[in-house]
Interface confidence: low
């Protein structure tokens, strides 16, 4: 009768990859054993004498190893085996998008490790060792509240990351003002201006993560572009929720996203989610009222462009309220597109 | 130029309580960590108390933790200390003080004092 | 807690005199000390702060220097207004923030 194992088995770690010679317990080496993974029977030529060989151990080795007697089947050994590889250097990443109030850091490993990992994260703002709350949803992410506003003494995030094969630690050093991120702008609505073909109104919400816009106000990047080109066009806002478009091109479907920075400090936000728009035309389009109501009101799409950056934000390019069109575009040599080439130029 | 001014002082029996107050001027105080610092009469400094810039982190020393309560009005650029059970070991000057947020910290500014005597 | 020592607790001392005063740590902290002045009746004053920097309007009489567990607070050329007691206070494991027991310096 085979016996339900009594003891807990014996878990082992062994890196992918790697050979492993799995004794049975204390058996003899010459001992008539049978070796079974999860339940079921291994080759005996898997074994060298009593103890069990495994050569370029692959993830599927992990499994749950017996031994048993051969004549009696009684359990000599059990070996939980894991199958995986030690942790490579984390990414750290820390950011404050609910500036004054604090800001989160989060990691990740760049390659999985297949078994389980421990994360420690230490915070030290000078040398005073900062609490990092663990965040209630997310098992990977930390939250640290400021003491004091605008200190000039760096931030030090450390994370040291460990597990049975191994370990491994980064850190980030900062300032206070340079993590400073908001979220992006919320409920971005762009409408037809009723009578006024190149017209676009866009509203949008301050981002709700961002505590106090009174005392640390947001400026707003909008950007927009016909469907059909590639080009965006840009215009810096440096308060209000709202900005009238002024130079769209009748009919022409529109996709607008916006950006927010804290006035001062910080970074640009990630583009919001993109609204759609069509400005007014005046003659009849001759289409089905549901699809022109598709088309002059507003939805929503997520966006895969990249946020502002920096050069987003040099003034020499955001002067010029011409449409270029560059080769890629038309396929040919670049060029000034006006309203009425854009009235030939249909859907790639 | 900055000025901090505490008020609430008084005589008070062994186990009252006592709620003292510290009117800042001069520097934008809902930006900084604000202390309470006491001496004994005749003896040395022993801080007390921080809160943090938006009132969310409180800290106390080990003599006066679950006694005294700090809190804050950026409203009103005013730091609170709520004295409760009071010992006679709590007798003495009381100074508010704004932490420096430059490396590394220090009291920068400092009240007056006001005078909190705890005698049966 | 970190504790701070300073010594002497009092001090006599002349006008003109070269006056030093410690502090001791119960561990290192770095360079995370400052040095105030309180005169009777008064609120402290800061002096020296990371051990040896001079705070903006204090004479350069006045001068700090350590590092890890102990620091000296030094008067070149004692004035009559210097006469006051003298705190340490270390500011590298906080909170709580610690100071010294004080150094009283008189007139001899």
């Known amino acids: 009768q085979r016996h339900s194992p009594q003891e807990a088995p014996h878990v082992q770690y062994e890196r992918l990859g790697s050979d492993v010679t799995l004794p049975c317990g204390t058996a003899n080496w010459d001992a008539a054993v049978t070796w079974r993974v999860n339940g079921t029977d291994l080759a005996p030529d898997l074994l060298n004498g009593s103890q069990l060989v495994l050569r370029g151990l692959e993830l599927g080795h992990s499994g749950l190893y017996a031994c048993f007697h051969r004549d009696s089947w009684h359990l000599r050994h059990q070996v939980l085996l894991h199958v995986g590889l030690p942790p490579r250097e984390p990414v750290l990443s820390c950011r404050s998008n609910t500036y004054p109030k604090g800001f989160y850091c989060s990691w990740h490993l760049p390659t999985p490790t297949y078994i389980p990992n421990t994360f420690n994260v230490t915070v030290l703002h000078g040398s005073k060792i900062m609490v990092c709350e663990k965040d209630p949803a997310l098992k990977n992410r930390c939250h640290i509240r400021y003491m004091h506003l605008f200190s000039t003494i760096k931030y030090k995030v450390s994370i040291s990351v460990s597990n049975a094969l191994g370990h491994n630690a980064t850190a980030i050093t900062f300032d206070e003002f340079t993590i400073v991120k908001p979220d992006p702008p919320e409920n971005v609505v762009a409408r037809p201006v009723p009578s006024n073909p190149r017209r676009l109104e866009v509203t949008w919400q301050i981002p709700s993560t961002w505590p106090d816009p009174e005392s640390f106000p947001l400026k707003f990047f909008l950007r927009y572009r016909p469907l059909i080109l590639d080009q965006w066009q840009h215009v810096e806002l440096s308060d209000g929720t709202a900005h009238t478009i002024t130079d769209a091109y009748a009919g022409k479907e529109y996709i607008i996203q916006v950006a927010a920075k804290d006035n001062e400090i910080g970074t640009w936000s990630d583009w919001s989610v993109a609204a759609h728009a069509t400005p007014w035309t005046e003659e009849p389009r001759h289409l089905t009222t549901e699809a022109q109501a598709a088309e002059t009101t507003t939805s929503t799409t997520s966006s895969l462009a990249p946020p502002p950056t920096t050069k987003i934000c040099d003034p020499g390019e955001l002067g010029s309220e011409q449409k270029l069109i560059s080769e890629e575009d038309l396929g040919g040599e670049q060029k000034l597109i006006s309203e009425e080439d854009l009235h030939h130029h249909h859907h790639h | 130029q900055v000025q901090l001014v505490e008020s609430g002082g008084d005589v008070v029996q062994p186990g009252r309580s006592l709620r003292l107050s510290c009117a800042a001027s001069?520097?934008?105080?809902?930006?900084?960590?604000m202390h309470w610092v006491r001496q004994p009469p005749g003896k040395g400094l022993e801080w007390v108390t921080i809160?943090?810039?938006?009132?969310?982190?409180?800290y106390y020393a080990d003599s006066v933790k679950g006694r005294f309560t700090i809190s804050r009005d950026n409203s009103k650029n005013t730091v609170f200390l709520q004295m409760n059970s009071l010992r006679t070991e709590d007798t003495g000057f009381y100074y508010c003080?704004?932490?420096?947020?430059?490396?590394?910290?220090?009291?920068?500014?400092w009240g007056q004092g006001t005078l909190v005597t705890v005698s049966s | 807690d970190i504790q701070m020592t300073q010594s002497p607790s009092s001090l006599s001392a002349s006008v003109g005199d070269r006056v030093t005063i410690t502090c001791r740590a119960s561990?290192?902290?770095?360079?995370?000390l400052n040095w105030y002045q309180q005169k009777p009746g008064k609120a402290p004053k800061l002096l020296i702060y990371?051990?040896?920097s001079l705070q903006s309007g204090v004479p350069s009489r006045f001068s700090g220097s350590g590092s890890g567990t102990d620091f000296t607070l030094t008067i070149s050329s004692l004035q009559p207004e210097d006469f006051a007691t003298y705190y340490c206070?270390?500011?590298?494991?906080?909170?709580?923030?610690?100071f010294g027991q004080g150094t009283r310096l008189e007139i001899k």
């Open positions: 003080a704004a932490q420096s947020s430059t490396w590394p910290e220090y009291f920068q500014y």
């Open positions: 001069g520097f934008t105080f809902s930006y900084y960590g």
């Open positions: 809160i943090s810039f938006d009132g969310s982190q409180k």
């Open positions: 561990q290192s902290i770095s360079s995370y």
């Open positions: 990371a051990a040896s």
């Open positions: 206070q270390q500011s590298y494991s906080t909170p709580p923030i610690t």
